[in-house]
């Protein structure tokens, strides 16, 4: 198939980093500066992405691959290929239209991005709250109240001792 294609289309011989120049008898011409072609046989090159402003260059553009951007400190990437930079907040906060706001009581955020999420409701699993939640941390659920009834131990019992003469399982 490749051989048939190259017989039909001389442009298929043009490698990445070039374009097939229709104005010059379909010769392979190098991509102009600040442009690239990542695949062979292209009729034009593509403009390199510019990492400006809040974006910074993670990988320079080359004749065969686009530039890659990330975000300056204090911001994080959003979207495919870091198409947007969003402001970081502190742990215990979330980003709103009015900037970073503390998490409401009963919610937490343990990251510098994302939204405040409700504390885990321990009682839904029949458990009790072992450690209270904060703006930065979720609650820690402990054993269920039934496990803490008189006579019951919250400590895991030791493994039974092996009888003499028995080899390990």
């Amino acid at each position: 198939f490749e051989r048939t294609r190259s017989l039909q289309d001389p442009c298929s011989n043009c490698p990445a980093g070039t374009f097939c120049d229709n104005n010059r008898n379909q010769i392979c011409s190098p991509c102009p500066p600040n442009s690239f072609s990542s695949a062979g046989g292209q009729r034009t090159c593509d403009i390199c992405r510019q990492c400006k402003g809040v974006f910074r260059t993670r990988k320079e553009c080359s004749s065969t691959s686009n530039a890659e951007c990330d975000c300056t400190p204090g911001f994080h990437c959003l979207g495919a290929g870091c198409s947007m930079c969003e402001q970081d907040c502190k742990q215990g906060q979330e980003l709103t239209k009015k900037g970073c706001k503390d998490c409401c009581f009963g919610t937490f955020n343990d990251q510098k991005r994302g939204i405040c999420r409700p504390w885990t409701n321990c009682s839904l699993d029949g458990k009790s709250v072992l450690v209270n939640g904060t703006k930065e941390r979720d609650v820690v659920c402990g054993p269920s109240p039934a496990d803490l009834s008189p006579g019951a131990s919250s400590v895991t019992p030791p493994a039974p001792a092996r009888e003499p003469g028995h080899s390990p399982q």
Epitope: F19, D21, N23, S29, C31, P32, P33, N34, S35, R43, T44, C45, D46, I47
Partner: nanobody, 122 residues
Framework: EVQLLESGGGLVQPGGSLRLSCAAS????????VGWVRQAPGKGLEWVSA????????YYAESVKGRFTISRDNAKNTLYLQMSSLRAEDTAVYYC???????????????RGQGTQVTVSS
């Protein structure tokens, strides 16, 4: 009609200097991304230098950095390439080129002149 006329080439000894000129007509150099490409004997075209983003930045191939300087005279609508510390591997035909941005987002380039021959030899 867009025309680009190169001049200033010649035979020069290694370590010598030349200044290439490109007189443009049919378009305004200062409003375009323009530069120089070259073709060495038996080789493909190679970008040498360019003025990009309407003069906002310059580009130089690694092989010519620190030796070649691109500039333009907007009043004369002329592009220049000052070449110094010339080497045998700089021997090529040099063409003035204009970067073309297509409506669909693609990029190519156009060079209309006959080029100017630069030969570096002792």
């Amino acid at each position: 009609e867009v025309q680009l006329l190169e001049s200033g080439g010649g035979l020069v000894q290694p370590g010598g200097s030349l200044r290439l000129s490109c007189a443009a007509s049919g378009f305004t150099l200062s409003a375009e991304d323009v530069g120089w490409v070259r073709q060495a004997p038996g080789k493909g075209l190679e970008w040498v230098s360019a003025i990009l983003d309407f003069g906002g930045s310059t580009y130089y191939a690694e092989s010519v950095k620190g030796r070649f300087t691109i500039s333009r005279d907007n009043a004369k609508n002329t592009l220049y390439l000052q070449m110094s510390s010339l080497r045998a591997e700089d021997t090529a035909v040099y063409y003035c080129a204009r970067v073309v941005y297509h409506a669909g987002g693609g990029v190519t380039f156009d060079y209309r002149g006959q080029g100017t021959q630069v030969t570096v030899s002792s």
